[in-house]
């Protein structure tokens, strides 16, 4: 089974860890795919290691573990993220995370210039 936090939030400009936990007594993980909606973020292959899609290569860092660290968040990063665990034997397991990127608290409390 896949265990994950279904809803997480982070500040604009900050970073967040996307993490899915797979537990099984028999199946071994052969590959983990991470997607933002339908767009590939990164792939971890037991054979070949980590592969980060070029579109995200400056903002996505593999890890910790089989998760991802998503940096320099923007409001446009709000949305659904999916982890897909390919296992053998046992097949495919999927998890879903909804990320809400909130306006930075620094921006929220800026004072208007005098005059």
């Amino acid at each position: 089974t896949i265990d994950t936090k279904r809803n997480i939030s982070a500040e604009e400009g900050g970073s967040v860890i996307l993490q899915c936990h797979f537990s099984s007594d028999t199946a071994e993980v052969t590959q983990v795919d991470w997607k933002q909606q339908d767009q590939l973020l990164a792939i971890y292959s037991v054979d070949l290691g980590w592969h980060v899609a070029s579109v995200f290569s400056d903002r996505v860092v593999p890890g910790p573990s089989l998760g991802l660290t998503f940096q320099s968040l923007t409001m446009n990063d709000t949305g659904e993220y999916f982890c897909t665990y390919h296992t053998y034997p046992g097949g495919i397991y999927k998890g879903r995370i909804f990320l809400k990127v909130q306006e930075s608290s620094v921006a929220q409390f800026q004072t208007a210039p005098l005059g």
Epitope: L48, H51, S54
Partner: antibody, heavy 123, light 109 residues
Framework: QVQLQESGPGLVKPSQTLSLTCTVS??????????WGWIRQPPGKGLEWIGS???????YYNPSLKSRATISVDTSKNQFSLKLSSVTAADTAVYYC???????????????WGQGTMVTVSS | EIVLTQSPGTLSLSPGERATLSCRAS???????LAWYQQKPGQAPRLLIY???SRATGIPDRFSGSGSGTDFTLTISRLEPEDFAVYYC??????????FGGGTKVEIK
């Protein structure tokens, strides 16, 4: 759709280095799901995989050729290249480039191929 | 490495007949990693089957793949004139490295 085209000299002298380039058109080499590979076929014989590369430069090779083969990528030109050093007559073959779906797991295969280029090793 | 042995080496059949091509692996291969290709003289190989049994885009349904473990089969239900070619199986593991079978030539009887 994605197309691949090999280019390079058709004749290489023994002990020299064979150099080939594959140009990808109709799609980006930076597509995250694919490696890009080289396969060869000596005249009248079967297919032999040489190695494959990811847009980031990650590679995996056939151990039997790893000491002589180097695959590189140029994302700005949407190309990847093969260099095979210290060639002998046994390296005479048609060399193909192909899209490698090794990261597609249940679709692992070479799904798109170039038309191939014949390379003869002879003095 | 995993050695793929294809049999028979040559298959002589007439158009309309059924062709059964065998691919045997020296050790177990995940069916997800087994592919079949067709090659005609002077042309590049063309992907027919991936994942042991899934037809690639545009491949007619007279081509089918089956098998698991060490024994895999490509079947052409009714041979058309354009099907006479050489067929290769391939296993796409990384360690040990991916390999191709030696090929089966399907020729007109």
């Amino acid at each position: 759709q994605v197309q691949l085209q090999e280019s390079g000299p058709g004749l290489v002298k023994p002990s020299q280095t064979l150099s080939l380039t594959c140009t990808v058109s109709g799609g980006s080499i930076e597509s995250g799901l694919y490696y890009w590979g080289w396969i060869r076929q000596p005249p009248g014989k079967g297919l032999e995989w040489i190695g494959s590369i990811y847009y980031s430069g990650s590679t995996y090779y056939n151990p039997s050729l790893k000491s002589r083969a180097t695959i590189s990528v140029d994302t700005s030109k949407n190309q990847f290249s093969l260099k095979l050093s210290s060639v002998t007559a046994a390296d005479t073959a048609v060399y193909y480039c192909a899209r490698d779906g090794v990261l597609a797991l249940n679709k692992r295969s070479f799904d798109i191929w170039g038309q191939g280029t014949m390379v003869t090793v002879s003095s | 490495e995993i050695v793929l042995t294809q049999s028979p080496g040559t298959l002589s059949l007439s158009p309309g007949e059924r062709a059964t091509l065998s691919c045997r692996a020296s050790q177990s291969v995940s069916s997800s990693y087994l592919a079949w290709y067709q090659q005609k003289p002077g042309q590049a190989p063309r992907l027919l089957i991936y994942g042991a049994s899934s037809r690639a885009t545009g491949i007619p349904d007279r081509f089918s793949g089956s098998g698991s473990g060490t024994d895999f089969t490509l079947t052409i239900s009714r041979l058309e004139p354009e099907d006479f070619a050489v067929y290769y199986c391939q296993q796409h593991t990384v360690r040990p490295p991916l390999t191709f079978g030696g090929g089966t030539k399907v020729e007109i009887k």
